[in-house]
């Protein structure tokens, strides 16, 4: 998106003040995922807890099948943070045996869906190659940024591999997002 | 929470205008830990550099005794982050004896009390395994995410063992809250 | 920054309302990187994509020689994810034949540079040791904190070595900011 | 493979509520947004509005707005266009298609002729 | 309503030519999209996002410009290509679609 400069005057006649409590709100907790069908190529989107524990969404930011809901135009920050969890990885063993291998990764997507592009759009990712020797092992990807959204965009969080992501706390594994 | 909705008219009379410069804000950053009690099945809680260097809290929002306060209920975005250092962890050296182990691991959780709640609340936690071989390590734990708190609760960071955590630069470790 | 206590009617004579839509902001993507020269105690900046694609610079934040602009004073959130990717580190290598070795390193600096102050200010610091057998690897750091920033100040990332720096993809390494 | 079906009928009187159906198969559409398109004999296309299935949210083309109503139903993978109070100006080929989770895809288009 | 003007309305040419197509938009958008409609068919999206060439579409098809003005491009006319084509914009409500461009083989 091409940055739009306006001068404060101009700026200020579109963008009436609003009281900030107002505002689209979101936070989503991890739940236990039930496997899904997902497109070939695309990785598979979480589906979330939004009103029990911590989990909130407020001000017209809904909740629906995986998607989070933008019901107007704006600046939001959007974060979410999984936490992965496996056994040994693959890669790890091949190389006791020392031959170098592309590492297993685990990855996390956060996408954009909007009826004005064909594609689903990447707005972060995070991705990290995983190759632990001899035991279980587990971590977590965070990401957080700034974008320009749409009333009626759609927001989800891919992931490499659903059967690695950590469901059993809502502070492990998280979606959020607010209109600045 | 269940997710509250409101027609804008009925939020804007209850959510007054106000100015961003006067919201509750504050960003605390590392200092030498010196080592307290802890109850045995609680990670001990750090504290912080409240005012010097790139440290403020302001706004009524205030730091005391480790825990930040918070002075007004509303939606807030707290993050922290947790720079990590280590020697080789046990679990690598039990490992090239050809045993796998329970991994060390590293964690930081950010914990809220409130006083009319007997028990803490874990609102965020990163958690991960460390298995190097044979050198130092460090590594940064991040997390950041926004929840509706009440006035008069209590903020806190806590880890899974203080004398890991790198308190050398107040960039590396940090702690911080602002109302949205 | 001594943290600044107004009572909130003092406040509110000095912080007029606005729009929030009329606050300064940026997110910027990453770009392949030119080498460039750099301080030999200085980690090189990196530059950015600052109007196409996810980024895009508004109301007066501009960004200019690998500087994101601060137009105005006041509270900024600030965030940069890199990514990194390397072939097998040394101290691997190293350590296979028993030594421990000090271990090959990532790091992360989003740096404040003030007219006024003749050195930079480190504002976040993500260092990460890393000391992977046998294959490539690839893993994020992300940082994101608030800080009371001056018109006038220049923000910029640093890194530990821009050639392990992954400018494939704008969802993987971005750099943003905004007025709170 | 992905596959969108217009159904309804192809005659409709004067005055009368239009109704078309658009099932949807090969994917699942929750992921994406549906439109109606419509094209008049020898005109160009024109585009009547859209549905987010996910959330029944819509938007219509402000000049059929008081007329047009889409809806969708989940269970059956199913978006429906009504138009009311037809006139033969509204004689056309009614297009169902997809945009947003994926390329676009169009359905083969319904022709919807409205006549006493 | 942003309002979209297609030139020509209609072009004949050779095959093997280059072929261009204009849209002018009454107001700046960010976007265009092209859609190519064979007689009888449902349109097919060609480019999106003013220069995307959508999957499985041949390379010969490009777009590009700005703000109002937009340009689509077939760099060597081939027989099955003969089809009316059409741009969208999809920012303003409603979204809007040029009146169409009639290419046929000289």
């Known amino acids: 998106l091409k940055g739009q400069e306006f001068a404060p005057s101009h700026q200020q006649v579109y963008a009436p003040l609003r009281a900030d409590g107002d505002k689209p709100r979101a936070h989503l907790t991890v739940v236990r995922q039930t496997p899904t069908q997902h497109l070939k190529n695309q990785f598979p989107a979480l589906h979330w807890e939004h009103e029990l524990g911590l989990a909130f969404t407020k001000n017209r930011m809904n909740y629906t099948n995986k998607f989070l809901l933008i019901p107007e135009s704006g600046d939001y920050f959007v974060y979410s943070q999984v936490t992965f969890r496996g056994m040994t990885s693959e890669c790890s063993e091949i190389r006791q045996a020392g031959r170098p291998n592309k590492p297993d990764s685990i990855t996390v997507v956060i996408t954009k869906v909007t009826d004005s592009y064909p594609e689903p759009t990447q707005l972060l990712m995070g991705t990290k190659s995983v190759c632990e020797v001899g035991s279980n092992w587990f971590q977590p990807i965070y990401l957080g940024a700034m974008f320009s959204l749409q009333e009626g965009d759609k927001l989800m969080v891919n992931v490499s591999d659903i059967s690695l992501v950590d469901y059993t706390k809502e502070d492990k594994t998280f979606f959020g997002a607010f209109l600045l | 929470l269940k997710g509250q909705e409101f027609a804008p008219s009925h939020q804007q009379v209850y959510a007054p205008l106000r100015a961003d410069g006067d919201k509750p804000r504050a960003h605390l950053t590392v200092v030498r830990q010196t080592p307290t009690q802890h109850l045995k099945n609680q990670f001990p809680a750090l504290h912080w550099e409240h005012e010097l260097g790139l440290a403020f809290t302001k706004n009524r929002m205030n730091y005391t005794n480790k825990f930040l306060l918070i002075p007004e209920s509303g939606d807030y975005f707290v993050y922290s982050q947790v720079t990590f250092r280590g020697m080789t962890s046990e679990c690598s050296e039990i490992r090239q004896a050809g045993r796998p182990n329970k991994p060390d691991s590293i964690t930081v959780v950010i914990t809220k009390v409130t006083d009319s709640y007997p028990e803490p609340t874990q609102l965020l936690m990163g958690t991960k395994s460390v298995c190097e071989v044979g050198s130092n390590w460090f590594q940064p734990i991040y997390l950041g995410a926004m929840f509706s708190l009440q006035e008069g609760d209590k903020l806190m960071v806590n880890v899974s063992d203080i004398s890991l955590v790198d308190y050398t630069k107040e960039d590396k470790t940090f702690f911080g809250a602002f109302l949205l | 920054l001594k943290g600044q206590e107004f009572a909130p009617s003092h406040q509110q004579v000095y912080a007029p309302l606005r729009a929030d839509g009329d606050k300064p902001r940026a997110h910027l993507t990453v770009v392949r990187q030119t080498p460039t020269q750099h301080l030999k105690n200085q980690f090189p900046a990196l530059h950015w994509e600052h109007e196409l694609g996810l980024a895009f610079t508004k109301n007066r934040m501009n960004y200019t020689n690998k500087f994101l602009l601060i137009p105005e004073s006041g509270d900024y959130f600030v965030y940069s994810q890199v990514t990194f990717r390397g072939m097998t580190s040394e101290c691997s290598e190293i350590r296979q034949a028993g030594r421990p070795n000090k271990p090959d390193s990532i790091t992360v600096v989003i740096t404040k540079v003030t007219d006024s102050y003749p050195e930079p200010t480190q504002l976040l610091m993500g260092t990460k040791s890393v000391c992977e057998v046998g294959s490539n690897w690839f893993q994020p750091i992300y940082l994101g904190a608030m800080f009371s920033l001056q018109e006038g100040d220049k923000l910029m990332v640093n890194v530990s070595d821009i050639s392990l720096v992954d400018y494939t993809k704008e969802d993987k390494t971005f750099f943003g900011a905004f007025l709170l | 493979q992905v596959q969108l079906q217009e159904s309804g009928p192809g005659l409709v009187r004067p005055s009368q509520t239009l109704s078309l159906t658009c099932t949807v198969s090969g994917f699942d559409y929750q992921d994406t947004y549906m439109h109606w398109v419509r094209q008049r004999p020898g005109r160009g296309l024109e585009w009547m509005g859209r549905i987010d299935p996910a959330s029944g949210h819509t938007k219509y083309n402000p000049s059929l707005k008081s007329r047009v109503t889409i809806t969708r139903d989940t269970s059956k993978n199913q978006v429906s266009l009504r138009l009311s109070s037809v006139t033969a100006a509204d004689t056309a080929v009614y297009y169902c298609?997809?945009?947003?989770?994926?390329?676009?895809?169009w359905g083969q288009g319904s022709l919807v002729t409205v006549s006493s | 309503d942003i309002q979209m003007t297609q030139s020509p309305s209609s072009l004949s040419a050779s095959v093997g030519d280059r072929v261009t197509i204009t849209c002018r938009a009454s107001q700046g958008v960010e976007y265009m999209y092209w859609y190519q409609q064979k007689p009888g068919k449902a349109p097919k999206l060609l480019i999106y996002?003013?220069?995307n060439l959508a999957s499985g579409v041949p390379s010969r098809f490009s777009g590009s410009g700005s703000g109002t003005d937009f340009t689509f491009t077939i760099s060597s006319l081939q027989p099955e290509d003969i089809a009316t084509y059409y741009c969208q914009q999809w920012e303003g409500n409603p979204r809007t679609f040029g009146q169409g461009t009639k290419v046929e083989i000289k």
């Open positions: 996002a003013t220069s």
């Open positions: 298609a997809v945009s947003g989770g994926m390329p676009d895809v």
